[in-house]
């Protein structure tokens, strides 16, 4: 990292987080139902270095501390033997004493039907309680509405974590959005992003998330911050000595004129080195290519065709002015 600290926690030093932030990186909400009693009612500033209110996750408001737990904020999962939206109902009583639902043929118990609080209709960690007609949400501080769906938080509350910038609406009390620094996401910039999981590097580039920056290591033939530019493999790569550049697979190669070789056709090649003349033919280097002098009984540019005993060849008649056995130039 090019700066003194590897993460935002270090930036805060021993300074106390502003509400509603708590925890080492000031990214968790300290709510009364999930925090030690020393946090007191409502939200309080918490000092990261003292681990004050370094609480478990913010479970659904009202979730039983003895019989419920959560792995995600706003969740309430019950330990074995307990049920209900807040894990306050023992299974033994709930399964047979439910006032709703059809009778079970096997147990004779009433099978609970769907209740108004099932699935928890209250958003943002609100707790649901059944009413004679429907349900009622008790919203945590900062939220309101029938389902706690409306945020009362504004930029003045400092809701953007990890260096996020709060961008408010036209009037000071309107909703906010957080512009998150690279590497963070979520409505409050509270989630660290594995930016490579978004596969930002194109054309087979290798993604490297350096924390403060993202790098793409591009395959040969590609360039740009995201390997988005397909380089013209032959651009600026002239093949020498009359060679022709052939593009392919992010690299270039040269198809060299006879007598030249190497990556850029700069190396002089002996055209006879590969023994191109078949059946014992003799090879001669010529300014315009190689020439094969064929052994008796063979003909062709590389002496590849046998001459039949009656004088006919396996080929159509030799070109005019060329007798079988004459040297033939290989173009």
């Amino acid at each position: 990292y090019p700066y003194d600290v590897p993460d935002y926690a270090g930036m805060l030093g021993s300074a106390r987080c502003e509400p509603p932030a708590v925890g080492t990186a000031c990214t968790r909400l300290c709510r009364p139902r999930s925090a030690p009693s020393r946090c007191g009612p409502g939200l309080r500033p918490c000092a990261p270095l003292e681990d004050e209110c370094e609480a478990p996750l913010v479970c659904r408001a009202g979730c039983s501390p003895e019989h419920g737990f959560c792995e995600q904020p706003g969740e309430c999962r019950c330990l074995e033997g307990w049920t209900g939206p807040l894990c306050t109902v023992p299974v033994s009583t709930s399964s047979c004493l439910s006032p709703r639902g059809p009778s079970s043929a096997t147990t004779g118990c009433l099978v609970p039907g769907p209740g108004p609080c099932d699935g928890n209709p209250c958003a943002n960690g609100g707790s649901c309680s059944e009413t004679p007609r429907s349900f009622e949400c008790t919203c945590p501080r900062g939220f309101y509405g029938l389902r706690c769906e409306v945020s009362g938080v504004t930029c003045a509350d400092g809701p953007c974590f990890n260096g996020g910038l709060c961008v408010g609406g036209a009037d000071p009390d309107s909703a906010y959005i957080c512009h998150c620094p690279p590497g963070f996401q979520g409505s409050n910039c509270e989630k660290r992003v594995d930016r490579c999981s978004l596969q930002p590097c194109r054309n087979g580039g290798l993604c490297l998330d350096l924390g403060h920056a993202l790098r793409c290591r591009c395959r040969a033939g590609f360039a740009g911050p995201r390997c988005e530019h397909d380089l013209d493999d032959c651009a600026g790569r002239a093949c020498a000595n009359g060679g022709t550049c052939v593009e392919g697979g992010g690299a270039h190669r040269c198809s060299c004129a006879l007598g030249f070789g190497g990556r850029d056709c700069r190396e002089r090649a002996d055209p006879c080195a590969a023994r191109p003349c078949a059946h014992g033919g003799r090879c001669y280097a010529h300014f315009s290519g190689l020439v094969c002098a064929c052994a008796p009984g063979y003909m062709g540019a590389r002496c590849e065709f046998p001459v039949h005993p009656d004088g006919a060849s396996a080929l159509p008649a030799a070109p005019p002015g060329l007798r079988p056995g004459d040297p033939q130039r290989y173009l």
């Epitope: 935002y8 300074a15 003045a156 400092g158 260096g163 910038l165 512009h179 620094p181 920056a213 993202l214």
Partner: antibody
Framework: QVQLQESGPGLVKPSETLSLTCTVS????????WSWIRQPPGKGLEWIAY???????NYNPSLKSRVTISLDTSKNQFSLQLSSVTAADAAVYYC????????????WGQGTMVTVSS | EIVLTQSPGTLSLSPGERATLSCRAS???????LAWYQQNPGQAPRLLIY???SRATGIPDRFSGSGSGTDFTLTISRLEPEDFAVYYC?????????FGGGTKVEIK
């Protein structure tokens, strides 16, 4: 260390559009937010706008109706356009990189002076 | 918008002395998202402090920042000749990003 270089005309006529470009010396343009800040002669600093390669932009409300910021990753450049300029827009214009731990500015260009005169 | 007021406007001190610069915000600066910059004549500003108290890379430890809420301070423990410049604070908690008017530290 990455370097930023502003370019554009040093003289703009009143009511015309000021266009400036900032070239980033390396391929980090997709890794950071990029911003424009200006400083009238003998005065303080004023933030104008910032942009991220994802398309996120944010403008100073006092200039929003006249400002456009854009970014070209292929050229490692981002640009500023300020329309209907007046003498009050004469300033040194800086391009800057937004710090990765918040919206402060850790790398600055050397600045380009823009004069508004007919 | 959050208005930042810097004081004093000018500070006349001698090399080796301690400089204390103040930056006061019209509203609370959330999460101590406040930075300090140094600007020498004819040059671009340079980031000194971010997060109210963390030094940027390469900044000597004679520079320190403190404060939270609405009151912030930049302290230069022993002024060196190259420290005589203009200093700006900037908040980056709430848009629009705003700068203070600056404090000029001059040689007495």
């Amino acid at each position: 260390q990455v370097q930023l270089q502003e370019s554009g005309p040093g003289l703009v006529k009143p009511s015309e559009t000021l266009s400036l470009t900032c070239t980033v010396s390396d391929n980090s343009i997709s890794n950071y937010y990029w911003s424009w800040i200006r400083q009238p002669p003998g005065k303080g600093l004023e933030w104008i706008a910032y942009i991220y390669y994802s398309g996120t932009t944010n403008y100073n409300p006092s200039l929003k109706s006249r400002v456009t910021i854009s970014l070209d990753t292929s050229k490692n450049q981002f640009s500023l356009q300020l329309s209907s300029v007046t003498a009050a827009d004469a300033a040194v214009y800086y391009c800057a990189r937004v710090f990765h731990w918040g919206f402060a500015f850790d790398i600055w260009g050397q600045g380009t002076m823009v004069t508004v005169s007919s | 918008e959050i208005v930042l007021t810097q004081s004093p406007g000018t500070l006349s001190l001698s090399p080796g002395e301690r400089a204390t610069l103040s930056c006061r915000a019209s509203q609370r600066v959330s999460n101590t998202y406040l930075a300090w910059y140094q600007q020498n004549p004819g040059q671009a500003p340079r980031l000194l402090i971010y997060g109210a108290s963390s030094r940027a890379t390469g900044i000597p430890d004679r520079f320190s920042g403190s404060g939270s809420g609405t009151d912030f301070t930049l302290t230069i423990s022993r002024l060196e000749p190259e420290d005589f410049a203009v200093y700006y604070c900037q908040q980056y908690g709430t848009s629009p990003l705003t700068f203070g008017g600056g404090t000029k530290v001059e040689i007495k």
